[in-house]
């Protein structure tokens, strides 16, 4: 049996009666189709549920949607379809929730055969809606200015760019022939345009534009653009090089006023770049291999986004579906996992604890045996199922899960061997950010983190049978107890809990099926009476993140500092509470050469921590030189890793060299640029949010 499912393990007494009093069923009076859920605001308890049912009849689709609202975390729902005049809402655009706690909601209606469209707007957490007819048909979901929820941006199906300054009441077209538009910082809008009006055929001939005043004035900041993307403080553009179909990445950190060429390989038309993760300090960039290989290379940048270090070879990223298993483990600083496609075509999971500096296999869970994929039954690793496994149809109900406020916790489906197995996966947990793992539950499950990690819940995936049991753990997955939430099982479709993992409520969604119809049903369980008391100081213990060797006085040092956290004791059954704030104490570490990356023109020989000057700069390295301003070209060979806070210790001081004399290429010189361009080059394209997977900052 799975660990902790034995009888003597249970720590919570008399939980059945407590949970029974806090289990709320809601049956939805409509046919089963699809359901979209959205939490409106943080800690408000307001949830919107949009059910849609569509039937294709000949050439048209007949549809019906219903809108429900809860203000008690899903315990009760009220049908508010009449507030939107029983209009059919486009489920592909979902429910657009305003940033922060603005209480704003936008629903986009499907108005067949119309030259315009219709939206329903709410500013009061969906208590009331205002119907507004649009002078255009949106091509994608309307987006809020992240810093001002009254300002909206929309792209029409005729490639017009529209802006509203009064939360969708009045709209103004600010540009035409727009291919893609994105909000930048401080209300800036970046977009690509093509005067030919074609966005797909003429990629590579686009212009990148910027407006900082919502369309009053514009600036062309790049030409010969293939695509663009934003990540952290960086604006990236892939630009045609003038050498056939090759393109290169250029980067700007000043909103596109000036550009530098990134020291990355150029790619051909069948390849792509993708920003896997970015913040204000650095970026993880995937560069696809030539051909239909299904893999590429991850590079990590310096703080300028210009110099890149090779981080991981053979990184799995399918060209076809755009699947990558790259995941930011948000419960511990510097930790990321992803998959590689090994030489033998097997897929293996890798993990980095130092922001891409080094990658290793995941440690084998102590309570697991190596499976059939392992050559040596005593030596193998844990391999995690993520987006690629889900895309290939394996029985993996959920992606790996971590939360910033549930420090150190990672939940994931996986298998233990030499590579990912196609066999039925189990659920594994790490309580130290991925350093060590334990098998937590046998077989595939849906799972959620509640109360900042003080409570875990799980429901077994069972496609052929109804579900009426939920499992919960108050000790980070060591021990599990089961609660039967209904006598009448439901066909379970998913778990839902408020984003942020602060709630103690979880909803189980599913449907009941009879001979003639199927109905949506939800069960919301409030665990507040299980965690009866508020946690006190004595319930927390000091935990050192990234600890691998307690006897080393550099233990826990990652990127130049270590962090001690106050973490809830596994044995404490109490509420962290909604207002819980992670308590952490950082301490600076002494510098070593590991805290520095090699600057442009330098490299690290294998198994050496010193940066050595490259004998000569070849190929694309020469091209990089031309656009670097002088400060980019003077270097002592070392540059501190982005985000590294070390002090003292090793200070790699050596002669500062001017590398300009090594730059001999006349690649794409600025005077040959289109006069509209304000930098050496610019870029455009698409920031994709790959839902059901993870947030990819930009995929061309």
């Amino acid at each position: 049996s799975a660990p902790g499912e034995d009888e003597e393990c249970g720590r919570v007494r008399d939980f059945v009666a407590k949970l029974a009093n806090n289990t709320h069923q809601h049956v939805f009076d409509d046919l089963r189709g699809s359901v979209s859920l959205a939490w409106v605001g943080d800690g408000t308890g307001v949830i919107l549920a949009l059910t849609t049912f569509q039937v294709p009849i000949f050439m048209i689709t007949i549809g019906q949607s219903k809108l429900y609202r809860s203000e008690d975390y899903g315990k009760n729902f009220k049908d508010i379809t009449d507030l939107i005049n029983n209009t059919f809402i486009r489920s592909d655009f979902g429910i657009a929730i305003g940033p922060e706690n603005s209480g704003k909601v936008i629903l986009t209606a499907d108005v067949s055969g119309s030259h315009g469209s219709r939206i329903f707007r709410s500013s009061d957490f969906a208590k009331n809606f205002v119907q507004t007819d649009l002078p255009f048909v949106p091509l994608m979901q309307i987006t809020y200015n992240p810093e001002n929820s009254n300002v909206l941006l929309a792209l029409s199906n005729k490639n017009e760019l529209w802006v509203s300054k009064n939360f969708g009441g009045k709209w103004e077209e600010i540009h035409d022939t727009v291919c893609l538009a994105k909000w930048g910082r401080k209300g800036t809008i970046f977009f690509t345009a093509n005067h030919n009006g074609s966005c797909s055929n003429d990629r590579g001939m686009l212009e990148l534009w910027r407006t900082s005043d919502l369309g009053k004035s514009f600036k062309t900041i790049g030409v010969k653009i293939y695509s663009f993307g934003l990540g952290g403080k960086f604006l990236f553009a892939s630009v045609m090089t003038g050498k056939g179909t090759l393109r290169r990445i250029h980067v700007s950190t000043d909103q596109g006023d000036t550009w530098s060429m990134a020291q990355l390989p150029s790619v051909g038309h069948e390849q792509f770049y993708s920003i896997l993760a970015a913040n204000d300090e650095m970026v993880f960039m995937h560069v696809d291999e030539p051909g239909d290989s299904g893999f590429g290379t991850i590079f990590t940048s310096d703080d300028r986004g210009i110099v890149y270090s090779k981080s991981l070879d053979r990184h799995l990223y399918t060209t076809t579906g755009g699947e990558t298993d790259f995941i930011n483990v948000t419960s511990l600083r510097g930790v990321f996992t992803t998959s590689i496609l090994a030489e033998d075509k097997s897929i293996q999971t890798m993990i980095t604890f130092d922001q891409g500096g080094r990658w290793t296999h995941l440690r084998k869970p102590e309570n697991s045996e190596c499976d059939a994929t392992a050559k040596n039954k005593n030596e193998c690793s844990l391999h995690i199922h993520a987006a690629y496994s889900i895309a290939t149809g394996l029985n993996v109900p959920m992606l790996p899960l971590s939360e910033p406020n549930a420090v150190g916790l990672v939940l994931a489906h996986g298998s233990v061997g030499d590579a990912i197995s196609v066999m039925r996966p189990d659920v594994y947990i790490s309580d130290d950010g991925g350093y060590s793992w334990t098998k937590m539950l046998e077989g595939p499950h849906h799972y959620a983190i509640l109360d900042s990690g003080g409570l875990l819940v799980a429901v077994e995936q069972n496609a052929h049978q109804g579900v009426n049991v939920i499992k919960f753990s108050t000790d980070e997955g060591q021990c599990w107890q089961t609660y039967t939430f209904t006598r009448d099982p439901i066909f379970f479709t998913g778990l839902a809990s408020e984003p942020g993992a602060r709630s103690m409520n979880v909803s189980l969604w599913g449907y009941r099926s009879s001979l003639f119809h199927q109905q949506w049903v939800s069960y919301t369980i409030d665990f507040k009476d299980i965690l009866e008391r508020n946690c006190e100081e004595k319930d927390y213990t000091i935990w050192l993140a990234h600890s691998t060797d307690p006897e080393d006085y550099e233990d826990g040092c990652i990127l130049g500092y270590k962090e001690q956290f106050l973490r809830l004791r596994k044995s404490s059954v109490c509420q962290n509470g909604r207002d819980y704030v992670v308590t952490k104490q950082p301490s600076i570490c002494l510098c070593s050469l590991e805290d520095f990356l090699c600057d442009f023109g330098y490299y690290r020989p294998e198994n050496d921590s010193k940066c050595v000057e490259q004998p000569e700069l070849k190929g694309h390295d020469l091209e990089f030189c031309l656009y670097g301003r002088e400060e980019h070209l003077t270097t002592n060979g070392y540059r501190k890793i982005p985000g590294d806070k070390c002090q003292g210790g090793v200070n790699p001081v050596r002669e500062v060299k001017d590398l300009k004399k090594k730059c001999t290429s006349n690649f794409l010189s600025p005077e040959k640029q289109n006069s509209k361009s304000n930098g050496s080059a610019g870029g455009s394209g698409g920031l994709n949010d790959i839902f059901e997977a993870q947030k990819i900052e930009w995929h061309e």
Epitope: L544, S547, P550, E551, D552, D555, Q564, S587
Partner: antibody
């Protein structure tokens, strides 16, 4: 009973050498980092040196670096401090102390100390 | 080097009175601060580790608090046997350092 007993102190001339020993009992010596801490007469505590359980990590205070050598023999449950080129300012009671098993842990067990006097 | 500044240097207190000793670090040391008691002609004894965790066998009148750079040792109701020197010690960064000590005397 958990115990640390220092020995080897005494009077030595400046520039001379001395070897201190610390005998451990009542716990698994080979599992713990060990330390030497000294206290000059009428003064406060000063950390001198540290050695990890398997001698992988050895650390010294700047004031003794290059002159003192810490070592251990896990088979004999013993800790040592070889002191060379002794100076008057090395005069102190030298304590052997066990470090707890946690990261950045405290010195949880101390010996009774042995007096080292450096004088001509 | 992380410098630990202890205050006061000396305190003369009547029995049952509350004693507060502070220790300030020159830079953040997280929770890696420990308190020791040293009675005359004896070796130091650990009282509090990791800023606030009482060591086994230590009377409950001794407590510690703080994190980062500011730490406090409190003796809630002083007893005659508590006359001693008290030292703070940081283990966050090499070289390991101690505060200058606080001598507590019974009035």
């Amino acid at each position: 009973e958990v115990q640390l007993v220092e020995s080897g102190g005494g009077l030595v001339k400046p520039g001379g050498s001395l070897r201190l020993s610390c005998a451990a009992s009542g716990f698994t010596f080979s599992s713990y980092s060990m330390n030497w801490v000294r206290q000059a007469p009428g003064k406060g505590l000063e950390w001198v040196s540290s050695i990890s359980s398997s001698s992988s990590y050895i650390y010294y205070a700047d004031s003794v670096k290059g002159r003192f050598t810490i070592s251990r023999d896990n088979a004999k449950n013993s800790l040592y401090l070889q002191m060379n080129s002794l100076r008057a300012e090395d005069t102190a009671v030298y304590y052997c102390a066990r470090r707890g098993s946690g990261s950045y842990d405290a010195f949880d067990i101390w010996g009774q100390g042995t007096m080292v006097t450096v004088s001509s | 080097e992380i410098v630990l500044t202890q205050s006061p240097d000396f305190q003369s207190v009547t029995p049952k009175e509350k004693v507060t000793i502070t220790c300030r670090a020159s830079q953040s040391i997280g929770y890696s601060l420990h308190w020791y008691q040293q009675k005359p002609d004896q070796s130091p004894k650990l009282l509090i580790k990791y800023a606030s965790q009482s060591f086994s066998g230590v009377p409950s009148r001794f407590s510690g608090s703080g994190s980062g750079t500011d730490f406090t040792l409190t003796i809630n109701s002083l007893e005659a046997e508590d006359a001693a020197a008290y030292y703070c010690h940081q283990s966050s960064s090499l070289p390991l350092t101690f505060g200058g000590g606080t001598k507590v005397e019974i009035k």
